[in-house]
C-alpha cells in the first residue's frame, strides 16, 4: 500500500520518477516493463503453448468498460482463464497503453530498443491460490499478464469492439457496457511464440508479482483506430476545470541486470517467400 495517498500520473510532479516515494516497490526489484533484446534472451524448450479457455465471451453478456484515470479498462469474467502455467490463472481485466498523435509510440515493452504504437495487457490472477485479483496482486506468483504489442497497419475489427465505446468513457470514472466478444481475437498470430520473464505491475504499486508473457508477434490496428485511442480520453473527471488528455500512459523500460528473458522460440525468424519480396 502507498505510504500516503494514491495520486500518481505519467507526467509532471507525480510522474514515474516520483512513484517510489509513495510506492516503494516501484523503486525495487523485478520492475517492468523492459527492453527485449538479444543478449538477455534464452530459448527454453519447456515453454509450451498456452491455452486460452473461456475467452469467447457471449454478446448476450455485458462487460464493464471503465476510464480509471490512467487507462481504459475492460472487466473480464472469472471463468475466463489461461491453461498451461503452474496454476490456473483467471482473467480479471484488460487495458491498454499508448503514446500521442505526434509520437505514436506508446508500448511499454520495447524490442531491441524500439517502441510499438501501443500495448494491450490482459491481466489474470492465480485463482488456485487466491480468491480475487486484489488479494493475489501482492503475493508471489499472484498475477500473470499477457502483453500484446500493437503496431499501426490495417483496420482491426476486433479491437474496434472496444474502441467503438470510447466516447462513453471519455472522462475519469465513466463506465460503459460492452457486449462480449472473442477476446482471443485480440491476440496475435502464432501465440505459441512468446517472451517470458518475472516482473512487476507497470503501474503503482508496482508489485513484483507478475509472470509476464509478451507475444513475439504484434497485431495491427489502423491509423484511425490508434488516433481514436490517443485522442478520445481524459485523465480527469468531466467537471474538472483543468482537463488532462490521456496520452503517453506508458512507463519507461526498467533496468534488467543479471537476469534472463526466456523465449518459447529460437531466435532466428524464418522468412517466408512473401516476406522476401
Amino acid at each position: 500500500a502507498p505510504v500516503n495517498g494514491s495520486k500518481w500520473t505519467y507526467f509532471g510532479p507525480d510522474g514515474e520518477n516520483s512513484w517510489s516515494k509513495k510506492y516503494p516497490s516501484c523503486g525495487g526489484l523485478l520492475q517492468s516493463p523492459i527492453d527485449l533484446h538479444s543478449d538477455i534472451l534464452q530459448y527454453d524448450a519447456s515453454l509450451t503453448p498456452l491455452e486460452f479457455q473461456g475467452y469467447n465471451l457471449s454478446a448476450n453478456k455485458q462487460f464493464l468498460l471503465t476510464n480509471n484515470g490512467h487507462s481504459v479498462k475492460l472487466n473480464l469474467p472469472s471463468d475466463m482463464h489461461i491453461q498451461g502455467l503452474q496454476s490456473r490463472y483467471s482473467a480479471t481485466q484488460l487495458h491498454l497503453h499508448w503514446g500521442n498523435p505526434n509520437d505514436p509510440h506508446g508500448s511499454e515493452h520495447t524490442v531491441s530498443g524500439q517502441h510499438f504504437a501501443a500495448e494491450l495487457h490482459i491481466v489474470h490472477y492465480n485463482s488456485d491460490l487466491y480468491p480475487d485479483a486484489s488479494t493475489a496482486s501482492n503475493k508471489s506468483e499472484g498475477l500473470a499478464v499477457l502483453a500484446v504489442l500493437i503496431e499501426m497497419g490495417s483496420f482491426n475489427p476486433s479491437y474496434d469492439k472496444i474502441f467503438s465505446h470510447l466516447q462513453h468513457v471519455k472522462y475519469k470514472g465513466q463506465e460503459a457496457f460492452v457486449p462480449g466478444f472473442n477476446i482471443e481475437e485480440l491476440l496475435p498470430e502464432r501465440t505459441a511464440e512468446y517472451y517470458r520473464y518475472r516482473g512487476s505491475l507497470t503501474t503503482p504499486p508496482c508489485n513484483p508479482t507478475v509472470l509476464w508473457t509478451v507475444f513475439r508477434n504484434p497485431v495491427q490496428i489502423s491509423q484511425e483506430q490508434l488516433l481514436a485511442l490517443e485522442t478520445a480520453l481524459y485523465c480527469t473527471h468531466m467537471d474538472d476545470p483543468s482537463p488532462r488528455e490521456m496520452i503517453n500512459n506508458f512507463r519507461q523500460v526498467q533496468k534488467f541486470d543479471e537476469r534472463l528473458v526466456y523465449t518459447s522460440f529460437s531466435q532466428v525468424q524464418v522468412c517466408t517467400a512473401a516476406g522476401l519480396s
Epitope: 457471449s58 454478446a59 448476450n60 455485458q62 460503459a176
Partner: antibody
Framework: EVQLVESGGGLVQPGGSLRLSCAAS????????IYWVRQAPGKGLEWVGY????????TYNQKFKGRATISVDKSKNTAYLQMNSLRAEDTAVYYC??????????????WGQGTLVTVSS | DIQMTQSPSSLSASVGDRVTITCRAS?????MHWYQQKPGKAPKPWIY???ELMSGVPSRFSGSGSGTDFTLTISSLQPEDFATYYC?????????FGQGTKVEIK
C-alpha cells in the same frame, strides 16, 4: 416457455433486510445475466445490479453498492437479491429480468411478474 | 449518470390521435429502447435500438432520434395503446430509464 418468477416480498421493518428469489426456467440458465430492477409506487424503473450465473460475477448500480448483494444458486437456476438497512424509500416492486443481445445492443426480453416489498413500521 | 427526461409526464389523447413522446438524455447515447407497461404488469420491450419494433408491436408505432434526443410516435392511437412508456439507455453505467410517460384516454 422462458419464465422468471420472483418471490420473497412482503412487509419489512425499517432497518431490516430482505432476500428475494428469482427462479428461471425454459432456457440455458448460464447463458444470460440476471438483472434486478425496482419500481417505487407510481414511479419509474431503477436498475439495482446484475449477476452472471455462469461464474457469480456481479455488477451493481453505485447507488446500491454495499447495501445490495446479488448471488446465484446454479443448481436451482435461481438468483437472489439481498438488501440491508432498508428504508421507506426502498418500498417498491422488485423485478428480475433477462437481457438478450440482438444486432447491436441488448434489451430486456423477459421479466418476472415482480414482488412487492413494503418497508414500514 | 446519464439522466433521462421524458416529456410529457402524462398526456390525454383520443383514439385516432397522433401522439409523440420525447426522451432527452443528459449525454449522448448510442441507442434508445422503449418499454410499454400496463398497471399491475411488468414492462414489455416495445421498441429496440431506437427504431426497431419488437415482434408483435403494431406498425403505427415508430421510434427515431440520435445523440441525446429520441422520440416514440403513435400515428393513430388505439384503445390498447393506453399505458405508460419508458425509455432506457444502455450506453453508460448505470443503465437508466426515463421517469415514464402515461398515455391516458381523453
Amino acid at each position: 416457455e422462458v419464465q422468471l418468477v420472483e418471490s420473497g416480498g412482503g412487509l419489512v421493518q425499517p432497518g431490516g433486510s430482505l432476500r428475494l428469489s428469482c427462479a428461471a426456467s425454459g432456457y440455458s440458465y448460464t447463458d444470460y445475466n440476471i438483472y434486478w430492477v425496482r419500481q417505487a409506487p407510481g414511479k419509474g424503473l431503477e436498475w439495482v445490479g446484475y449477476i452472471d450465473p455462469a461464474n457469480g460475477d456481479t455488477t451493481y448500480n453505485q447507488k446500491f453498492k454495499g447495501r445490495a448483494t446479488i448471488s446465484v444458486d446454479k443448481s436451482k437456476n435461481t438468483a437472489y437479491l439481498q438488501m440491508n438497512s432498508l428504508r421507506a424509500e426502498d418500498t417498491a416492486v422488485y423485478y428480475c429480468s433477462r437481457p438478450i443481445y440482438y444486432g447491436a445492443y441488448w434489451y430486456f426480453d423477459v421479466w418476472g411478474q415482480g414482488t412487492l416489498v413494503t418497508v414500514s413500521s | 449518470d446519464i439522466q433521462m427526461t421524458q416529456s410529457p409526464s402524462s398526456l390525454s389523447a383520443s383514439v385516432g390521435d397522433r401522439v409523440t413522446i420525447t426522451c432527452r438524455a443528459s449525454s449522448s447515447v448510442t441507442y434508445m429502447h422503449w418499454y410499454q407497461q400496463k398497471p399491475g404488469k411488468a414492462p414489455k420491450p416495445w421498441i429496440y435500438a431506437t427504431s426497431e419494433l419488437m415482434s408483435g408491436v403494431p406498425s403505427r408505432f415508430s421510434g427515431s432520434g440520435s445523440g441525446t434526443d429520441f422520440t416514440l410516435t403513435i400515428s393513430s392511437l388505439q384503445p390498447e395503446d393506453f399505458a405508460t412508456y419508458y425509455c432506457q439507455q444502455w450506453s453508460s453505467n448505470p443503465l437508466t430509464f426515463g421517469q415514464g410517460t402515461k398515455v391516458e384516454i381523453k
